[in-house]
């Protein structure tokens, strides 16, 4: 699987999950989140050669098409597969509230 | 929706479904499919600016991050959303067989 366990411990050139830290204030302009100040969101990057963790029959066909037509702009793309939530603390007036922000952290990628 | 109805009748620069015809023999090297000789597979292409048909909260966060950090390589990617099957005919010896190949035709795209 193209997950953090594999991708973070290798020098994989193909589609893999990469490290990305997002600072809520600096990178998103969000000032209302109290904790954390930012988080490891990660992102997906890398080429999708034939038969690299391809998602559907279509993406397999497209990767094969790409192999036969190397100059074509039609190619599978490396995108998130497994996403995880992020717990945050914010204030409503003086009262702290804990929320789970769904689909915030990329754990693995796929070629789609 | 970034579907064939919208995308094929517009000059949309952002993520949209594009026309692509795949010839089974020439483009995939498949000689075993009797009918059809090829099909309109289509593909997804185009940038994913903030808030262009973004798929999950993560892809929206990433697009917003990208807006604040224009040089970053982390960005959502235009990939298939709705896929449709393709009926084919092939021969087992002299006997024709009809099969549905699932997930073969792109009908719409999304930014993931």
């Amino acid at each position: 699987a193209l997950d953090t366990n594999y991708c973070f411990s290798s020098t994989e050139k193909n589609c893999c999950v990469r490290q990305l830290y997002i600072d809520f204030r600096k990178d998103l302009g969000w000032k209302w989140i109290h904790e954390p100040k930012g988080y490891h969101a990660n992102f997906c990057l890398g080429p999708c050669p034939y038969i690299w963790s391809l998602d559907t029959q279509y993406s397999k066909v497209l990767a094969l098409y790409n192999q036969h037509n190397p100059g074509a702009s039609a190619a599978p793309c490396c995108v998130p597969q497994a996403l995880e939530p992020l717990p945050i603390v914010y204030y409503v007036g003086r009262k702290p509230k804990v929320e789970q922000l769904s689909n915030m952290i990329v754990r693995s990628c796929k070629c789609s | 929706a970034l579907d064939t109805n919208y995308c094929f009748s517009s000059t949309e620069k952002n993520c949209c479904v594009r026309q692509l015809y795949i010839d089974f023999r020439k483009d995939l090297g498949w000689k075993w499919i009797h009918e059809p000789k090829g099909y309109h597979a289509n593909f997804c292409l185009g940038p994913c600016p903030y808030i262009w048909s973004l798929d999950t909260q993560y892809s929206k966060v990433l697009a917003l991050y990208n807006q604040h950090n224009p040089g970053a390589s982390a960005a959502p990617c235009c990939v298939p959303q709705a896929l449709e099957p393709l009926p084919i005919v092939y021969y087992v010896g002299r006997k024709p067989k009809v099969e549905q190949l699932s997930n073969m035709i792109v009908r719409s795209c999304k930014c993931s």
């Epitope: 409503v92 007036g93 003086r94 769904s102 | 808030i51």
Partner: antibody
Framework: EVQLVQSGAEVKKPGASVKVSCKTS????????MNWVRQAPGAGLDWMGQ????????NYNEMFEGRVTLTADTSTSTAYMELSSLRAGDIAVYYC??????????????WGQGTLVTVSS | DIVMTQTPPSLSVSPRETASISCRAS??????????MHWYLQKPGQSPQLLIY???NLESGVSDRFSGSGSGTDFTLRISRVEANDTGVYYC?????????FGQGTK
Amino acid sequence: EVQLVQSGAEVKKPGASVKVSCKTSGYKFWFYWMNWVRQAPGAGLDWMGQIFPAWGMTNYNEMFEGRVTLTADTSTSTAYMELSSLRAGDIAVYYCARGYGNYALDAMDYWGQGTLVTVSS
Amino acid sequence: DIVMTQTPPSLSVSPRETASISCRASESVDSYGNSFMHWYLQKPGQSPQLLIYLASNLESGVSDRFSGSGSGTDFTLRISRVEANDTGVYYCQQNDEDPLSFGQGTK
């Protein structure tokens, strides 16, 4: 240009519910708190609650005794306020208003044009 | 809940004079070095518009004839060189404590 356009005036019977919409444009709807404020005829402003559209997080004013429900449709950048068990005291103009962005509870920098809700048997 | 009391309830001012409106909170609205107090104007038949943010910060696009001051529980909105266009109801609002609350307005 930031715009908040609300649905038209409503006339409802006591005990019924009303759902007011607030269609937004010109800003990142997903990532700003949206507040709802009501103003009874000739009276001041009462904060009803707020929603953060990206995750549907909500905070409500207890004064509305669980009668108010806030929702958001991110595909159309539209916020909704539903008020149930309507009574004569709910006759008011209802406003949607965008939060300033620094805090959850905050000042409100853009307002809808208001929707008059009348309760009458 | 924090109760906001505005004085006077109504005010008549001649053009080019200075108007002052007071807002008193039932408890301090200061936290983390900020005063969580804002001012709005609601012109006849219109929605409220933000004038002053965090006690003294002028909202963009608002005339610099408007100014805000104060901290803790006592706040003031001043309008210098008053114009006919300034007619309406002025509201203060706090967001230091849930629920967010408004003053009753000064006409």
